[in-house]
């Protein structure tokens, strides 16, 4: 007696490493009080889920803390939402609603979750001209990484005398003090994806006049 | 129309057992889980226990556990509540709903007393 | 178990009056929440499932919301028929248990 719903939109969806993707899923139908039940995503074949909202059932180790239900039976809403993308989570997905007190659940179509090399680069910002002695604030920027991912860490890489300013989530600043030598070096900001073990990067050619 | 109606209540004294029934109409009685919920005189609701559509799954509270057992037979659309080692703080009006708790019947009352 | 508390544990109040019902629970219960109105020697009656629900049959002057730990139900303006006690009661998981109610009576 299981009900069967289509997943909206499309069958497949791509997402780069490291970053994240939501699964849209609506609810067929404004659940009856008579069905109240859990749900759940499942990869296809396994018998464990990677997300779910029933708070009696373990999820897949591999997905603990990146998968995520945003479950909303009010407004429809069973989507999945997955963080920190790894090659390994490349694969087709379904959703189920199920209650163990009751006959029947709800299971969804299958959607595939693609998942490519991380291609997005850091941004290197510099405010007006380097000058020998003057300190600027250079800004590297992932702005393209999504807010609920797990941060990424900034690396640093010059010649030049330099020291950290401040960061927030997807920026970090630092402050650059060029000598006239150090024209035509290289700086480099890079940014590891801890949670997917990936690692981007940009380096320039500092221009000291 | 959908209907849930108790019976089995009555005086029983202190240590002794009795048996409730629920019969269900109206609805598909084996997809459904059932509830049994009871409330003592003036006093507020107190959940019981809770089976699975097929009887696989049952969950008892605190107070019951041991000497309560619900089950059902789907065959008969019939839910029952086994009571034994019956104590005076049982004396309650137990009803029984379904699932979503969303259909109720008119209860039976058990009152346990010496 | 998760408990579930209620406020006021009382009323008093006029028809018409615009009246609010409180339920904390002891943990996050997402919106697992659903409200019963129980009028003396009647079964409860199903107003508010999934928190914000409105059951089938239910006058639209009741309403539910909040979402965790916090769900509040309103009555708009209370008429006659709605002098009651009205319990909550969470479905996320076993024991699925009541809170103490709350009695709305004629002020």
């Known amino acids: 007696q299981e009900r069967r719903f289509q997943l909206e939109g499309p069958e497949s969806l791509t997402v780069q490493e490291g970053l994240c993707v939501l699964v849209p899923c609506r609810l067929p139908t404004t659940l009856p009080a008579s069905y109240y039940g859990y749900g759940y995503w499942f990869l296809e074949g396994a018998d464990v889920p990677v997300a779910t909202n029933d708070p009696d059932e373990e999820v897949q180790e591999e997905t603990r803390g990146r998968f995520h239900l945003l479950w909303d039976p009010r407004r429809k809403n069973c989507s999945l939402s997955i963080r920190d993308a790894r090659r390994r989570d490349n694969a087709a997905y379904f959703f189920r609603l199920k209650s163990k007190w009751m006959k029947y659940g709800y299971t969804s179509s299958k959607l595939s979750v693609r998942v490519m090399a991380l291609t997005h680069r850091p941004k290197i910002l510099i405010p007006g001209t380097l000058e020998p002695g003057h300190s600027k604030n250079l800004t590297c920027s992932v702005s393209w990484a999504c807010e609920q991912g797990t941060p990424p860490i900034f690396s640093w890489l010059s010649a030049a005398p330099t020291s950290l300013g401040p960061r927030t989530t997807h920026s970090s600043v630092l402050i650059i003090t060029p000598r006239p030598q150090d024209h035509g070096t290289n700086l480099t900001c890079q940014v590891k994806f801890a949670g997917a073990g990936v690692t981007t990067e940009r380096t320039i050619q500092l221009n000291v006049t | 129309e959908v209907q849930l109606v108790e019976s089995g209540g009555g005086l029983v004294q202190p240590g002794r057992s009795l048996r409730l029934s629920c019969a269900a109409s109206?609805?598909?009685?084996?997809?459904?889980?059932m509830h049994w919920v009871r409330q003592a005189p003036g006093k507020g609701l107190e959940w019981v226990a809770v089976i699975s559509y097929d009887g696989s799954n049952k969950y008892y509270a605190d107070s019951v556990k041991g000497r309560f057992t619900i089950s059902r037979d789907n065959s008969k659309n019939t839910l029952y509540l086994q009571m034994n080692s019956l104590r005076a703080e049982d004396t309650a009006v137990y009803y029984c709903?379904?699932?979503?708790?969303?259909?109720w019947g008119k209860g039976t009352t058990v009152t346990v007393s010496s | 178990a998760i408990r579930l508390t209620q406020s006021p544990s009382s009323l008093s109040a006029s028809v018409g009056d615009r009246v609010t019902i409180t339920c904390r629970a002891s943990?996050?219960?997402?919106?697992?929440l659903n409200w019963y109105q129980q009028k003396p020697g009647k079964a409860p009656k199903l107003l508010i499932y999934?928190?914000?629900s409105l059951q089938s049959g239910v006058p639209s002057r009741f309403s539910g919301s909040g979402s965790g730990t916090d769900f509040t139900l309103t009555i708009s303006s209370l008429q006659p028929e709605d002098f009651a006690t009205y319990y909550c009661q969470q479905s996320y998981g076993t024991p699925f248990t009541f809170g103490p109610g709350t009695k709305v009576d004629i002020k």
């Open positions: 943990q996050s219960i997402s919106s697992y």
């Open positions: 709903a379904n699932y979503g708790m969303d259909v």
């Open positions: 109206g609805f598909t009685f084996s997809s459904y889980g």
């Open positions: 999934a928190a914000s």
